[in-house]
Interface confidence: low
């Protein structure tokens, strides 16, 4: 009898752009053909998907965030075939470019700022909003009641991923107008990636990992 | 045409064993993996016991971990559920039911089931 | 273990309408979904898997849909021999677990 295979990986919680991952199908049988199924189609070889001994072994020579499967492996001789149960790989990656939302740049004074940072990470990343410069709050949102021209300034959002060990930013310019009228959308965003952060948020950038770890 | 054809329900009481039996035809019965499912009283299913095509690998839910035992005898095209320490939850229509060939997933084909009733 | 809720819990529709049933996971998985037609007094029967594979001889009025932890099973044109009970169950992987159906009465 063929027994039910199963799948062993060498690496489950692979970092996108990064690791390889080696699925292999268990057990060696002999007079036995191996087959793979991803996201229940039988498996396209890529230049990044190589097949090896005898198509028991399955190479994803660099993950991304879609490979994540599941994956299965089945074996099959002259009388019978079995097909393993599924397996899912946990690809870290991220974080992506944040977006603080909403996107308005121009508010008026007496107003509340309700901003809400998202990037997209696995895991979850950490989140830090910085005003000018300052570490204001680990948190996704930031909230200021009843803002006045005191609180122009540029408002950044950091994000980090202690998985990959990554980090992303974005800033938003953000103005404050003591007139009547309604405010204008106008303004600058710039935004910052990884080691590419503005000078200003490098000091903040020390300071939160050592927040963070201790 | 596939048949399966279960058989062994009875009314036992709580504590007590009872084997069912399914028999098998109109297939290649060795060469399908086989589990049980049942349906309880207020209609839910249930599946309760695997064993791959040769015998060689079962599983079983929490539920009914070490009380229940599966087997197959494969010269006799039968399928076997031996049930120990029943209660009451277990009062149940049991089915047996054949995975599509080659694989552990859905339930291809049915029998028609034997009541299992477990009461003092 | 992963849990399968479905919706609704009973149904009554004419023959010619269009039903749909829902089935969602506790947890994601893919396309390892299901469905089955019991009618009364009688085994399941296995109408689709795969989240849409239809199972041999079922008739294409019914068709699934879905990915991940969403899935529903839909009916065309319903006939007089449509009605009955519908359950979906998971198969990715052990333990299997089913939905607690919905019923599918004539109104």
């Known amino acids: 009898e063929l027994p039910k295979p199963y799948i062993s990986s060498n690496n489950s919680n692979p970092i996108e752009d990064k690791d390889a991952v080696t699925l292999t199908c268990e057990p060696v049988a002999e007079n036995t053909t191996y087959l793979w199924w991803v996201n229940n189609q039988s498996l396209s070889v890529s230049p990044r998907l190589q097949l090896s001994n005898g198509n028991r072994i399955l190479t994803l020579l660099s993950v991304t965030r879609n490979d994540t499967g599941p994956y299965e492996c089945g074996i099959q001789n002259s009388e019978s075939a079995k097909r393993s149960d599924p397996v899912t790989l946990n690809v870290t990656y991220g974080p992506d470019t944040p977006i603080i939302s909403p996107p308005d740049l121009s508010y008026r004074s007496g107003a509340n700022l309700n901003l809400s940072c998202h990037s997209d990470s696995n895991p979850s990343p950490q989140y830090s909003w910085l005003i000018n410069g300052t570490l204001r709050q680990h948190t996704q949102v930031l909230f200021i009641s009843k803002i006045t021209s005191n609180n122009n300034g540029a408002y950044a959002c950091f994000v980090s991923n202690l998985a990959t060990g990554r980090n992303n930013s974005i800033v938003k310019n953000i103005s404050v107008s003591s007139g009547d009228s309604a405010p204008g959308s106008s303004g600058l965003s710039a935004s910052g990636s990884g080691s590419g952060l503005n000078d200003i948020f490098e000091a903040q950038k020390i300071e939160w990992h050592h927040h963070h770890h201790h | 045409e596939v048949q399966l054809q279960e058989s062994g329900g009875v009314l036992v009481k709580p504590g007590g064993s009872l084997k069912l039996s399914c028999a098998a035809s109109?297939?290649?019965?060795?060469?399908?993996?086989m589990s049980w499912v049942r349906q309880t009283p207020e209609k839910r299913l249930e599946w309760v016991a695997y064993?791959?095509?040769?015998?060689?690998?079962?599983y079983f839910p929490d539920t009914v971990q070490g009380r229940f035992t599966v087997s197959r005898d494969n010269a006799k095209n039968t399928l076997y559920l031996q049930m120990n320490s029943l209660k009451s939850e277990d009062t149940a229509i049991y089915y047996c039911?054949?995975?599509?060939?080659?694989?552990?997933?859905?339930?291809?084909?049915w029998g028609q089931g034997t009541l299992v009733t477990v009461s003092a | 273990d992963i849990q399968m809720t479905q919706s609704p819990a009973s149904l009554s529709a004419s023959v010619g309408e269009t039903v749909t049933i829902t089935c969602r996971a506790s947890?994601?998985?893919?396309?390892?979904l299901a469905w089955y037609q019991q009618k009364q007094g009688k085994s399941p029967q296995l109408l689709v898997y795969?989240?849409?594979t239809l199972a041999e001889g079922v008739p294409s009025r019914f068709s699934g849909s879905g990915s991940g932890t969403q899935f529903s099973l839909k009916i065309n044109s319903l006939q007089p021999e449509d009605f009955g009970s519908y359950y979906c169950?998971?198969?990715?992987?052990?333990?299997?677990?089913f939905g607690s159906g919905t019923k599918l009465e004539i109104k």
């Open positions: 039911a054949a995975h599509y060939f080659g694989s552990s997933g859905p339930f291809a084909y």
């Open positions: 109109g297939f290649v019965f060795s060469s399908y993996d």
């Open positions: 064993i791959s095509s040769g015998g060689g690998i079962t």
């Open positions: 947890e994601n998985i893919f396309s390892y």
């Open positions: 795969n989240t849409k």
């Open positions: 169950q998971h198969h990715y992987g052990t333990p299997f677990t």
